[in-house]
């Protein structure tokens, strides 16, 4: 019976926002299965996904261990099915991914604002700070919890009858800016990490604007 | 060449916990999944639980689950189950067997007769 | 769980016979493993991912199927060959295992 030919998976790709991380690949399997195996450089190959159809595999549990580790990840074509195939001790085929460093190249998700509050002419915004899958001492951290001080965001805001846009930073989670009374504004946010080379900023939240309800409105 | 040696025969007196060994050699023991999987007299196989020693990862059957525990001394290269709470039902050959290319349970250990008795 | 169901449960054959084991399970299942297992014995992996032959496995044994029905065949029977052999599904939790075809001498 003659050897079963396995394609080599190719275009290793990582997808992974706030630390929510899956390796993609191609082709879509043709008599052939894949598994996955992850490693980071000092460590040891560790075997996820086995024996798969799909082109892809959830590594999530694997890099939150550890998010500022680099990550190596590599793909293993296997012969299965009602193929004809001869027994072999070789290693199969397999192809390397990227490295991926999740704490650098995390895509930062779109952010959301909880909540904004006027008094007087101060608003409060206030971004949720959004929980991740990185966990330490069996609770899940949040994104602030993970990146500390190298995030911040940048608030964008603007009153309703007019285009020109103003903008704050803050490495908390919460913006506190002067608005003219009797004004309404409109807001939105942008997740950055400065330091970053890559991936440095997030998608801008959905626009929120007063006089809707996610606002509470208190005149002194 | 992988060799799995589990350690002797038990016999256990009803309620008490067994531990079994399987010591590795021939490959590098923290990079694959162990696994263990037993055999009742004159029945089939059942799978109770692996380990990756690489990092102690660890899943069980939920038919066991409370009472297996299965651990990995990476400096002996040798894995370990511990069944508790023993009834006769237990008796039976526990195997201790690594993954391989393309199956998880390539290679087994000899393995170890535990009987319960009163 | 998925249960697998083989059948013969005894298959009593001459040496040279061809020997056809099939394996049913309660669900569809992606791919099948097969063992064989000799008294005193650990079982020895024989077939992988339905039809691939674990390294030094003869080429005698050959495996097929899909879904919900699997086959082993031993094209002829070599003294060796008699022995239990067991089919297994990892497409689901728990793994699973047959209970177990026995292949004695007629």
């Known amino acids: 019976s003659g050897t079963t030919n396995t394609v080599a998976a190719y275009n290793l790709t990582w997808k992974s926002t706030n630390f929510k991380t899956i390796l993609e690949w191609e082709p879509k399997p043709v008599n052939q299965v894949y598994t996955v195996q992850i490693s980071t450089k000092s460590g040891d190959w560790k075997s996820k996904c086995f024996y798969t159809t799909d082109t892809e595999c959830d590594l999530t549990d694997e890099i939150v261990k550890d998010v500022k580790q680099t990550y190596l990840a590599r793909v293993f074509s296997y012969p299965a099915g009602n193929v004809e195939s001869t027994g072999s001790a070789g290693e199969p085929l397999y192809e390397n991914s990227p490295e991926f460093t999740p704490y650098l190249e995390t895509n930062l998700g779109q952010p959301t604002i909880q909540s904004f509050e006027q008094v007087g002419t101060k608003v409060n915004v206030t971004v949720e700070d959004e929980r991740t899958l990185v966990r330490r001492n069996n609770t899940f951290l949040s994104l602030r919890d993970v990146f500390g001080k190298d995030l911040i965001y940048t608030l964008y805001y603007w009153k309703s009858s007019s285009s020109g846009k103003k903008t704050a930073k803050t490495n908390t989670n919460e913006f506190l800016i002067d608005v003219d009374k009797g004004e309404n504004y409109c807001f939105s946010v942008q997740a950055v990490i400065p330091s970053r080379t890559v991936n440095r900023k997030s998608t801008d939240s959905p626009v929120e604007c007063m006089g809707q309800e996610k606002g509470e409105f208190r005149e002194i | 060449q992988v060799q799995l040696v589990q350690s002797g025969a038990e016999v256990k007196r009803p309620g008490s916990s067994v531990k079994v060994s399987c010591k590795a050699s021939g490959y590098t023991f923290s990079s694959y999944w162990m696994y263990w999987v037993r055999q009742a007299p004159g029945q089939g196989l059942e799978w109770i639980g692996q380990?990756?020693?690489?990092?102690?990862?660890?899943n069980y059957n939920e038919n066991f689950q409370g009472r297996v525990t299965i651990t990995a001394d990476k400096s002996t290269s040798t894995a370990y189950m511990e069944l508790s709470s023993l009834t006769s039902e237990d008796s039976a050959v526990y195997f201790c067997?690594?993954?391989?290319?393309?199956?998880?349970?390539?290679?087994w250990g000899q393995g170890t007769l535990v009987t319960v008795s009163s | 769980e998925i249960v697998l169901t083989q059948s013969p449960a005894l298959l009593s054959l001459s040496p040279g016979e061809r020997a056809t084991l099939s394996c049913s399970a309660s669900?569809?299942?992606?791919?099948m493993y097969w063992y064989q297992q000799k008294p005193g014995q650990a079982p020895r992996l024989l077939i992988q991912?339905?039809?691939n032959l674990a390294s030094g496995v003869p080429a005698r044994f050959s495996g097929r199927g899909s879904g919900t029905d699997f086959t082993l065949t031993i094209s002829s029977l070599e003294p060796e060959d008699f022995a239990v052999y067991y089919c297994?599904?990892?497409?689901?939790?728990?793994?699973?295992f047959g209970g177990g075809t026995k292949v004695e001498i007629k």
């Open positions: 669900s569809s299942v992606s791919y």
């Open positions: 067997t690594r993954e391989g290319y393309g199956n998880r349970f390539a290679y």
């Open positions: 380990i990756y020693p690489g990092d102690g990862d660890s």
């Open positions: 991912l339905t039809s």
């Open positions: 297994q599904q990892w497409s689901y939790n728990p793994p699973t």
